[in-house]
């Protein structure tokens, strides 16, 4: 009889007696920026502090009738989903409510900013345990709202936001588009994207993961023991805020980067039917449904990575795309992808002391994406080795020459625009382990890292027959850090990582032109962290069909 | 995720000689004006003036006061609704859109964003 949504996100081994407070004694506090709430509801009484914060616009319409139960509906439900005794994710968590949405569920960017500042002031006046801020609201893209979220996140606060219910790219909305926020889309009991009337959950590269958001039973403000079902990305975000609160109550020192990586790593993969999303967004949207991760004590030492897509570069000839990792993460590799296949490659460069992944459009191209592989590598020392393009007819190669440094990724960038001139680059470990090799007119970049116990190997998979994509996966215990395409005769669209799978995409119009000897190869660099071992390079594996 | 989305950014580097103030004439607006791409969600008349990150507390207040003074000279009354100190330097102001050009030329201003609606999801 446990509600479907709790069963979905809380694995059986985490299900405690119905009313048990979160494990551990750390006082995690969740701040909810929403409508007013009914603090006396039996589901949340004694767990909620209704702050005196109130910054809302006037309700529309001269005949608007303020009915307390309607004014409190949205916020009460979400408070229940986060910390409710029976239908809540983090049953013992204390919650503070700030009213930034009026009785019609409308607020302003300025009111939300003042609310975020109120939280910052509270933090300064009385420092407490870990703070989680739930933002179950969305407006159009706002530079200042995103900036405020960034500033608050840098003080150690974890912000969780609704992706939005507009069946649209979440990057067009704020705070969903803020990189420092954990942005959550909504799925239903069948793990499918939520449809809401003619609209539905937002999607795209600004969504970190999905969580239950359809027919979620929770506290209703109709009465102190009333419950109702509500749907939306607000409910999905509330689930993730609850999960984060539980994670922090067990391990209060987890950082935002660790929380995000663990949420991604332990989520349920590949259950969402991606056909629901627009075709151009499918590759950018994570196929992840949140579940409560085990503690790091149970799963320590894993190398955790995630894929970060840039915004689309746009079609201009010199258009570039930039993908960034979070400050705490290491950029272990950089690749690029273009739907037309017209791209001039990718490289890593330092901007303002941070390494970023760049991709360059080619003449006649419709634009490119830069694809960064961002990882948590404790005590890592990483660097980029670059060899400029060699003279005509010669190949360029670069390897990790520092002692104990291992190759985690390769990038290739062509100086010339003429696609016919170049034989595209290759990653070749047969000649020398841990070496990136490019063909003529390509600059080659090797990402090299030293970290205690870090070891890496190349795994290749080639297909000679017609295929739109070639994939290769890292085996259990290994984490994909780099992904490249080594082309046959056909034009490649690029390569990117999906969880532990390296996907090399091929231009489908060229499928018939390929001869059997010209296999397109997906080359993955797979790494793992062995706490006691020294950094090492493992001889690679490859096979062709 | 950090690039500007479907978002309007307008450069309002308007001539400043009408003011006849040396310090103002010397300061050419490099700040930008931004507003929500969805017209129905905009709240014209309320603006968030965002200052450069290193702006000191006193300078925030001085900038807000300077805007009030200069607006008054032009016969406009503006209302500073809130000053932001703790998350970012800036202030929230209720004023006519006629004053945007003036506000963008104030020292320390990085950009001005028109207020807009957010909605429960």
């Amino acid at each position: 009889s446990i509600p479907w949504n709790l069963e979905r996100i809380i694995p059986a081994w985490h299900q405690t007696e119905e009313d048990r407070s979160p494990d551990g004694s750390s006082q995690v506090e969740v701040y909810l920026l929403d409508t007013s709430i009914q603090g006396a509801h039996r589901e949340i009484e004694g767990r909620v502090t209704i702050t005196d914060f109130n910054s809302v616009p006037e309700e529309d319409g001269t005949r608007f009738h303020r009915q307390a139960s309607k004014c409190d509906s949205h916020g009460t439900h979400l408070a229940g989903v986060v910390s409710g005794r029976d239908a809540g994710v983090a049953k013992g968590t204390s919650l503070h409510s700030l009213r930034v949405l009026n009785c019609q569920g409308k607020g302003t960017v300025s009111g939300t900013l003042i609310g975020l500042e109120f939280i910052r002031k509270s933090q300064l006046i009385q420092p407490s345990g870990p703070l989680v801020v739930l933002l179950p609201l969305a407006g159009g893209y706002s530079r200042i709202l995103n900036a405020a979220c960034r500033h608050l996140a840098r003080t150690g606060v974890v912000l969780v936001a609704a992706a939005g219910n507009f069946r649209d790219d979440a990057c067009l909305y704020s705070p969903a588009s803020a990189p420092e926020v954990i942005t959550v889309g909504a799925t239903n009991a069948q793990d499918q994207p939520v449809t809401l009337g003619t609209l539905g959950t937002n999607f795209g590269r600004c969504v970190d993961l999905f969580a239950p958001g359809k027919d979620i039973i929770g506290a209703s403000s109709d009465c102190s023991t009333c419950f109702m079902s509500q749907s939306g990305t607000s409910q999905a975000a509330a689930h993730v805020a609850g999960i984060v609160a539980r994670m922090l109550s067990r391990e209060p020192t987890l950082t935002l980067a660790e929380l995000r990586q663990r949420l991604i790593h332990f989520s349920t993969k590949d259950v969402i039917n991606m056909a629901w999303f627009p075709e151009d967004q499918q590759v950018l949207t994570p196929n992840l449904v949140a579940t409560l991760p085990p503690s790091t004590h149970e799963t320590g030492g894993q190398l955790l990575c995630r894929t970060v897509w840039s915004a689309h570069s746009g079609p201009t000839r010199t258009a570039t795309a930039t993908a960034r990792c979070a400050p705490e993460e290491e950029l272990l590799s950089c690749s690029s992808f273009s739907r037309s296949g017209r791209r001039r490659g990718d490289w890593i460069e330092a901007i303002g002391g941070q390494q970023v992944c760049k991709a360059l459009n080619a003449f006649g191209g419709e634009g490119v994406y830069a694809v960064a592989r961002c990882c948590l590598v404790p005590r890592a020392n990483c660097s980029i080795h670059n060899t400029p393009a060699a003279r005509a007819g010669l190949e360029t190669h670069v390897h990790c020459h520092q002692k104990d440094h291992v190759l985690t990724g390769c990038s290739f960038h062509w100086e010339v625009e003429d696609l016919s001139v170049r034989r595209q680059p290759a990653l070749r470990s047969r000649r020398q382990p841990g070496q990136c090799v490019g063909h003529q007119a390509a600059s080659v970049y090797a990402s090299c890292c030293h970290a205690p116990g870090l070891e890496c190997k190349i795994k290749e998979h080639g297909i000679s027959g017609p295929s739109e994509q070639v994939t290769v996966a890292c085996e259990a215990g290994w984490t994909l850090t780099g992904c490249n395409v080594l082309p046959g005769a056909s034009l490649t669209l690029g390569a990117y990582s999906v969880d532990n799978l390296c996907v090399a995409r091929v231009h489908d119009t060229a499928r018939a032109d390929r001869t059997s000897g010209e296999a397109t190869v997906a080359a993955a660099i797979c790494c793992r962290s062995r706490p006691s071992a020294k950094a090492s390079w493992v001889q690679h594996h490859h096979h062709h069909h | 995720q950090d690039e500007d989305g479907d978002y309007e950014e307008l450069m309002l580097a308007l001539p400043s000689q009408e003011d006849g103030l040396a310090d103002e004439a010397a300061h050419v607006a490099t700040a930008t004006f931004r507003r929500c791409s969805k017209e129905a969600w905009r709240l014209p008349g309320t603006y968030i003036v965002v200052l450069m990150e290193e702006t000191q507390r006193l300078q925030i207040e001085q900038t807000a006061h300077r805007l009030q003074t200069r607006a008054a000279r032009r016969g406009y009354v503006i209302k500073v609704l809130h000053i932001f100190y703790d998350l970012f330097p800036g202030f929230l102001v209720k004023m006519s859109s006629d004053l945007l050009g003036l506000a963008l030329k104030l020292p320390h201003v990085e950009y001005i964003e028109e207020d807009s609606f957010v909605f429960a999801q």
Epitope: S1, E17, D19, R42, G46, R85, S220, T225, F227 | -
Partner: antibody, heavy 118, light 107 residues
Amino acid sequence: QVQLQQPGAELVKPGASVKLSCKASGYTFTSYWMHWVKQRPGQGLEWIGEINPSNGRTNYNEKFKSKATLTVDKSSSTAYMQLSSLTSEDSAVYYCARERPLYAMDYWGQGTSVTVSS
Amino acid sequence: DIVMTQSHKFMSTSVGDRVSITCKASQDVSTAVAWYQQKPGQSPKLLIYSASYRYTGVPDRFTGSGSGTDFTFTISSVQAEDLAVYYCQQRYSTPRTFGGGTKLEIK
């Protein structure tokens, strides 16, 4: 597992008082309200009142306000109901029941049969 | 006080039959209604909460529906062990009130 233990029976004289107990185990006693329900032989269920064990807050059915007093002892995880000035009308089975916000009265005691007789 | 009215004090049915018990609230109680089963000599047992949700371990032949003032409890295929009195209860406000009960008799 959750249990609510009640004594089986109490025999009391008219005009006297009786204090019924309900010992809770298998869950955090202070997390959920405790309710008391009366059932006369061959009759339906009648709600008497409820108490919040964490703070002692009570709500009564107006009909029982001068008849019943609800208390708790957190240290022993026990809820009590004192019935005063007993008459034959008070002869009934009295149940304690834990109420969860979502799941209503999900666990009931076995009931204490109170007989008022001289 | 909110009055909960179960129109039938008794209902007679056969094994395998479908039976529905109705309950009417004197005012809107949203979905804050629970249904209980009480077998002879036993304590009441929770079957349905929030008008339509089946409690843990309750067979799926038992269902609940309704909101506002009209509620229905249904047994899709009556079994011999379903002989009992069934009560509706509103949890919308205090005092909590129960319906008078419907005794299900097996022919």
